[in-house]
Structures are given as structure tokens and as C-alpha cells.
Interface confidence: low
């Protein structure tokens, strides 16, 4: 039959060339003379001339050595024609398979591979993968099958078999426990790739395994006990710097310290922060400490890291004994602002109140007193007892110094400490009204016509407070009632002045006595200008000129 089985040809053949491979033969050669030819890549198209055929015998010829890694298979067509050139057979497919020889070594894809793994990981943890390639065939032969191995490990601590490599995949894994970055931060592995599945040619490369830091070391206080001295009342005062050591990677979260006050800070007086460079714990006062309340605080501080521990570690604690130092504290008036009710106008020398301060310090310090601000100069203060007395007339109606019935005084207390300290207090005297002002009419000058005069309404004011004010009473004195009448309205807060007899144009004094609800009397002279006119007038008209 006009067929040919696939032909296998080893690569790198020795020859001699041309080398006969197979014979094409058509059974039509019994009837007529047959001529054979081949076409296709490797015959009449690139790469031309690798194969040829003996025209008359049909022998397929190989003209030179083959390279499987260049072309692994050739597909040609065989033709048979008669002498007159007529085709006697359909074109026949000829497959030539190039079989592999182990003519290539493995090649790693990199000279140096880098990988990393956390310290302290369990055996079996994958680190990295390395890859080597081999151009030879790995499907039908072992020529291109690469097997990986570790040739050497440096350093050999804690022993020389810390890693293994999967012979087929090139995956490097941890095989032993004991990876400790603090002891060995990096391993250098010399790795091999060998073809023929480990029995052939070998090539080498380097795998560098970086051991990454894990938080497997707790920060430790050094020292663990501290004594500190802090003045009382100081806020934001640096009490103590706590020092820790940590074997983990500096400036990493596994190294950076986190401090926590675990006990002893009952009143939330302290705070602790981490210094960004030194990693020290800076203990400071959040609130002022009080020597008199508690002169010693014992704090327990725990240190951990920003990163969580990767295994259960005993944490370090420090004990800080904080001694509070006594400071001479200022006397404090009790209360800081004292309200006292006192009648206005009390006699000079009369006691107003006693206003004293307490000294927070435990020693029996002597406190002396004086007035710091007394705008009207109405008061004096005994330096020893804090007794406040009147030395001037307290006047509730004095608008310059009294606001809303209150006279404000500032007093000072000074202790005899070294150096002495002072405290101030505010004394608010609420002045109780006394009926010391009579009613006063407004206005005190009027203009009125002597014919059909309009009644004059005068407002009554009294500086005192109720009940020392309205209702008011009015009375005319010194014969003013001959020509005038004075009547208080129903509300009792205005007086109506009326002219009851004719007076010639002139200016007159009207003597008006007003008294308040407490019968405090006040005499006022009203200047009345009487005009020659009718009804309402504001100023007297000029003299009448007839025509």
C-alpha cells in the first residue's frame, strides 16, 4: 500500500550522510515506471534539503544531523508519478519524529533566589520556590526531568538541615524547628538541579532565605524597680523614664514598647507614653498629686509590644514608688466667694463678717489677712482673725460702687511659709436697704398760665427700695397752699400741682413736702414761672403790643 509508518530519527546522529531512512513504494510500479518526490518543510521549503528522496528507488534520505530542540517533528508529503508526469497515487503523509538525546544541562531561572520566612515557624512551612529549566524532553524521556536538591547550608546553626527542597517542584520548606532571627537572620543555600531525574547533568544556584522577625521576645524592664520624687500639684511633670530591652528587630512593631499602668493609680493621676526613639516609657502626672492626701504612690507598669506576641511570653512588670514632695500651698478661702447680707449705713466700727482661709499644708502655718480691693474704702480687715468691719458708710444707693445691691471686695490671705504663698477670696456684701432717702419730684421747674391754667404732673422718685417708697404723700408748706394745690394720684407715684388763684406774671417758689411709705419726708422747692396766658404754655409770651 501507498502508506508509510511514522519514522523516528534520533537527534545528533553521526551519519554517514545521506542516511537512508525508509523506502517509498507504490504497487503501481508493476504496470509503469514510477518516479518519487517529496515536498514540505525540510524538503523543498525551509529548512530546505534536510530530507531528500532517491527519484527512482523511493529511498527517503536524511542529509544532516537533526536537533530536536530546534524542530521536534517534520511533516512531509510523498508523491508518485508515471513517466509522462501523471500522478499515479494521492500525496502520502510522511511524519518524521526527532527523538531526544540528553544534550542540554538544566538552567536555573535566576542565579540567586531570595525568600523569607518568619522565625519560629513550624516544620513544613513553605519558604519559596526555585525553578530550573531543561530544553531536553521530559515527556517521553528523563532527559529533561529536573530533580532539585540542597547542596549546602550556611551557617549550619542550629544545625545543617534547617531546610528541605521538594525534588520535583523546587519548593523550599522549613524542615526543623529553631529558626531564630536573633541568632541567625539569614541563611544561604546552595541548590542543585540535576536532569535525568537526578542522575544526569547538574547545575547550581544560590537561595538566600531571610529570617523575618516575629515578636518572640518580650520587652524586659531593666531595672524593674524605680523610685521617683514629684512635687505635689505638678501637672504634666515627668516622673520617671522606664527602660526596657527587647531582642526583636529595632523600631519594628515587635520592638516598640507599649506601656500600661496595671495598678496603683487609683485616682488616674498618671499617664505613660512611649518615647519614639529610645523606646522608654515616660511616666508623667496627668493630674496634680496631693501630698497631704497621699504622700506615696506605688505603681505597677506592664510592658508589651505594639505587635502581639507570637507565643505565650511572661510579660515584664516594673514597680515605681513615687514619693510626693510637699510644696507650700496657698491658703484657700472658704468659701472662695462669700456672700454676706449687711444693712447699709451701719455705724463705723461695726463688724460685717469673719472671712478666713484654710491652709492645705499640714503644718500649723500662721495666716494673715488684708483687703486687696475695696473700691469705696468702706471696710477694714483684722490681719489675724479675718474680722471685716465697717470704716466708712456703706451706701446701697451709691451707683459708682454698688451694682444690683452688691458691693464686691477682694481679700488676701498669706501664710508664713518659705517662700510665703497667697490666696484670694471674694466678699460679696449684699446691702440691705434702709429708708435713708425721701421722695423727690421731677421736674423742679414749671411754667404755667395764670388764666385757665393746666395742671402740672410731677413724677416722684425715691432711691430706696420697696417698702421705703410709694405710696407717697404730698403737702404744701410755707403758705404755698394759698395759691396752689398738691394731690398725689391713685397709684401714689405722681403729684399734681395746680394754680388755684390768679397770680400776676412772675417767678414763684412753691414749697412741696413729699413723704414715702416709711414716712421719710423731703422738702423740695418748685420754681414756678407764671405767665399771662391761657391754658397750656411752655415759655411766657412777650409783652402784648396793641395795634
Amino acid at each position: 500500500d501507498w502508506v508509510v509508518a511514522p519514522i523516528s530519527v534520533p537527534e545528533n546522529g553521526k551519519g554517514p550522510f545521506p542516511q537512508r531512512l525508509n523506502q517509498l513504494k507504490s504497487n503501481k510500479d508493476r504496470d509503469t515506471k514510477i518516479f518519487y518526490s517529496i515536498t514540505g518543510p525540510g524538503a523543498d521549503s525551509p529548512p530546505e534539503g534536510v530530507f531528500a528522496v532517491e527519484k527512482e528507488t523511493g529511498w527517503l534520505l536524511l542529509n544532516k544531523p537533526l536537533d530536536r530542540e530546534e524542530i521536534a517533528k517534520y511533516e512531509l508529503f510523498g508523491h508518485a508519478v508515471s513517466e509522462n508526469g501523471a500522478s499515479v497515487e494521492d500525496p502520502m503523509n510522511i511524519s518524521i519524529i526527532v527523538t531526544d538525546q540528553n544534550d542540554h544541562k538544566p538552567k536555573f531561572t535566576q542565579d540567586t533566589f531570595r525568600g523569607s520566612v518568619l522565625e519560629g515557624v513550624l516544620p513544613g512551612t513553605s519558604v519559596m520556590q526555585v525553578t530550573a529549566t531543561d530544553e531536553d524532553d521530559a515527556i517521553y524521556t528523563y532527559n529533561g526531568v529536573v530533580a532539585y536538591s540542597i547542596h549546602s547550608q550556611e551557617p549550619k546553626d542550629p544545625h545543617d538541615l534547617m531546610f528541605t527542597i521538594h525534588r520535583s517542584t523546587g519548593t523550599i520548606s522549613v524542615i526543623s524547628s529553631g529558626l531564630d532571627r536573633e541568632k541567625v537572620p539569614e541563611y544561604t543555600l546552595t541548590i542543585q538541579a540535576t536532569d535525568m531525574d537526578g542522575d544526569g547533568s547538574t547545575t547550581t544556584a544560590v537561595a538566600v532565605v531571610e529570617i523575618l522577625d516575629a515578636n518572640d521576645n518580650a520587652p524586659m524592664f531593666d531595672p524593674q524597680k524605680y523610685e521617683a520624687h514629684v512635687p505635689e500639684n505638678a501637672v504634666g511633670h515627668e516622673v520617671q523614664r522606664l527602660t526596657v530591652t527587647d531582642l526583636d528587630a529595632p523600631n519594628s512593631p515587635a520592638w516598640r514598647a507599649t506601656y500600661l499602668i496595671m495598678g496603683g493609680d487609683d485616682g488616674d493621676h498618671f499617664t505613660i507614653t512611649t518615647h519614639p526613639e529610645s523606646n522608654q516609657g515616660i511616666l508623667t502626672t496627668r493630674k496634680g498629686l496631693d501630698f497631704e492626701a497621699k504622700n506615696q504612690h506605688t505603681l505597677y507598669v506592664e510592658v508589651t509590644n505594639e505587635a502581639p506576641f507570637v507565643l505565650k511570653l511572661p510579660t515584664s512588670t516594673a514597680t515605681i514608688v513615687v514619693h510626693v514632695e510637699d510644696v507650700n500651698e496657698a491658703p484657700v478661702f472658704v468659701p472662695p466667694s462669700k456672700v454676706v447680707e449687711v444693712q447699709e449705713g451701719i455705724p463705723t466700727g461695726e463688724p460685717v463678717c469673719v472671712y478666713t482661709a484654710e491652709d492645705p499644708d499640714k503644718e500649723n502655718q500662721k495666716i494673715s489677712y488684708r483687703i486687696l480691693r475695696d473700691p469705696a474704702g468702706w471696710l477694714a480687715m483684722d490681719p489675724d482673725s479675718g474680722q471685716v468691719t465697717a470704716v466708712g458708710t456703706l451706701d446701697r444707693e451709691d451707683e459708682q460702687f454698688v451694682r444690683n445691691n452688691i458691693y464686691e471686695v477682694m481679700v488676701l490671705a498669706m501664710d508664713n511659709g518659705s517662700p510665703p504663698t497667697t490666696g484670694t477670696g471674694t466678699l460679696l456684701l449684699t446691702l440691705i436697704d434702709v429708708n435713708d432717702h425721701g421722695p423727690v419730684p421731677e421736674p423742679r421747674q414749671i411754667t404755667i398760665c395764670n388764666q385757665s391754667p393746666v395742671r402740672q404732673v410731677l413724677n416722684i422718685t425715691d432711691k430706696d427700695l420697696s417698702p421705703h417708697t410709694s405710696p407717697f404723700q404730698a403737702q404744701l408748706t410755707d403758705d404755698s397752699d394759698i395759691y396752689w394745690t398738691a394731690e398725689v394720684n391713685e397709684e401714689g407715684d405722681t403729684v399734681v400741682l395746680s394754680l388755684k388763684k390768679f397770680l400776676k406774671q412772675d417767678t414763684y417758689d412753691v414749697h412741696l413736702s413729699l413723704s414715702d411709705h416709711g414716712n421719710k419726708e423731703q422738702l423740695t422747692v418748685i420754681r414756678a414761672t407764671v405767665c399771662d396766658c391761657h391754658g397750656h404754655v411752655e415759655t411766657c409770651p412777650g409783652p402784648w403790643k396793641g395795634g
Epitope: T258, L260, M262, G263, Y300, E302, T304, N305, E306, A307, P308, F309, P314, T315, T317
Partner: antibody, heavy 123, light 113 residues
Framework: QVQLQESGPGLVKPSETLSLTCTVS????????INWIRQPPGKGLEWIGV???????NYNPSLKSRVTISVDTSKNQFSLKLSSVTAADTAVYYC?????????????????WGQGTLVTVSS | DIVMTQSPASLAVSLGERATINCKSS????????????LAWYQQKPGQPPKLLIY???TRESGVPDRFSGSGSGTDFTLTISSLQAEDVAVYYC?????????FGQGTKLEIK
């Protein structure tokens, strides 16, 4: 099996001192912090204080002036003393073990509790 | 002191239904150095001491049925009972152990509808 058992007088007179003990079995007494908690009848839980494994204590500020927690390792017992009691101190008192984050540390959820003992303050 | 606020004060849920209890703290209970939330949940039945259900906000205590779960971080936490059983009727408390004094929520009474 870890067990805690509170004991003490069920009736205390006003102004006197309430004294309770907590006996621990099944675990080393110095291994974990011990808390005291109380619960007035029909009400919620109030933490009284803790004693750490090293013997240090921390108390609730609301009771601090009146409370003392101590340990007697020879008897495997913890004690609670609350002075100047009033009717407001009537409650079931529990002792409970903290799970412990670290060995010295009193912080932690309370995983083992005693059955509690009712203390009534009345004359 | 850290104030713990539970809601609701009482809750009635049908058997087999989901029950959810909330707990809010007045400050964060997340501790930066170990990324743990210092919160526990307890169950208390009448005449008995409280029983620890959940710690570290979401870790179930050994022997606690898996229908109980805890979630949340910082200041907001939740206890969930996925399918209520008759034996779950109790008062539930949250508790912070982030800082002294330890404080509890006021409790949530869970009943069957």
C-alpha cells in the same frame, strides 16, 4: 476540677465588719487572680475587687475605704472584709477566678465562680 | 469608670428564633498591643452564679453550645443566640475587664415568647 466555695455569717449587724472566706480547690491558689463580686437581691452584679497572684490588690473605688482582700496560702483561702456595713450591703457575695491574661495579671474573664453566699445586714 | 450599657433590658423571643443582645461601653475595650477586646458575656439563671459564655468578645468558652456567639470591637458588642432553646431563659450580662474597676452591664432578661 476547679472549685470555689464562699463561707461566712449570713447575718451581720449595721456598722459591723462583714467577713467572708473563699476556699479554692483543684488548682494552685497562686496560679490565678481571685475576684469578689456581689449582687443585691433582684439587682445586677457589682465587682468589689481582685487579688493578684503576687498578692497585690485592686479595689472598686466606691468601696475602697471599707474593703480588704487578702490570701492565706497555707489554707488555700482568700478572705474579704467589708467594714461599717449598712443595709445597702445586703447581697449575695461571690468569689470568682480570673482566667488571667498573664500570670501576674488580674485582667481576664471570670471562668469559675463559687455558688455565692447571702449576707443580710440587719439589726 | 467604664460604663457598660446593655439593650434591651428584656427580650422575648420564640423558640428556635434568633436572639440578639447589645452592649455598649463608654470607651474602647480594644487593647492595641494584642488586638484583643477585653469583653466577656455571662449567663445567669435564678439561684445560680453567673456562667462564662464568651471572652475576648468572640471566643466561646469550652463547653458552651455553638448557638452562642459574640461579635463586635471597640465600643459596640453583640451576643447572638442563633436558635433559642428553652434552657437559654436567663439574665445575660456583659462585662469589661479592660481596666479597673471591672464593670458589668445592667443585664438583659431573656424570655420565651
Amino acid at each position: 476540677q476547679v472549685q470555689l466555695q464562699e463561707s461566712g455569717p449570713g447575718l451581720v449587724k449595721p456598722s459591723e465588719t462583714l467577713s467572708l472566706t473563699c476556699t479554692v480547690s483543684g488548682v494552685s491558689i497562686t496560679s490565678y487572680p481571685i475576684n469578689w463580686i456581689r449582687q443585691p437581691p433582684g439587682k445586677g452584679l457589682e465587682w468589689i475587687g481582685v487579688i493578684w497572684t503576687g498578692g497585690g490588690t485592686n479595689y472598686n473605688p466606691s468601696l475602697k475605704s471599707r474593703v480588704t482582700i487578702s490570701v492565706d496560702t497555707s489554707k488555700n483561702q482568700f478572705s474579704l472584709k467589708l467594714s461599717s456595713v449598712t443595709a445597702a450591703d445586703t447581697a449575695v457575695y461571690y468569689c470568682a477566678r480570673s482566667r488571667g491574661v498573664y500570670d501576674f495579671d488580674g485582667r481576664g474573664a471570670m471562668d469559675y465562680w463559687g455558688q455565692g453566699t447571702l449576707v443580710t445586714v440587719s439589726s | 469608670d467604664i460604663v457598660m450599657t446593655q439593650s434591651p433590658a428584656s427580650l422575648a423571643v420564640s423558640l428556635g428564633e434568633r436572639a440578639t443582645i447589645n452592649c455598649k461601653s463608654s470607651q474602647s475595650l480594644l487593647y492595641s498591643s494584642n488586638q484583643k477586646n477585653y469583653l466577656a458575656w455571662y449567663q445567669q439563671k435564678p439561684g445560680q452564679p453567673p456562667k462564662l459564655l464568651i471572652y475576648w468578645a468572640s471566643t466561646r468558652e469550652s463547653g458552651v453550645p455553638d448557638r452562642f456567639s459574640g461579635s463586635g470591637s471597640g465600643t459596640d458588642f453583640t451576643l447572638t443566640i442563633s436558635s433559642l432553646q428553652a434552657e437559654d431563659v436567663a439574665v445575660y450580662y456583659c462585662q469589661q475587664y479592660y481596666s479597673y474597676p471591672y464593670t458589668f452591664g445592667q443585664g438583659t432578661k431573656l424570655e420565651i415568647k
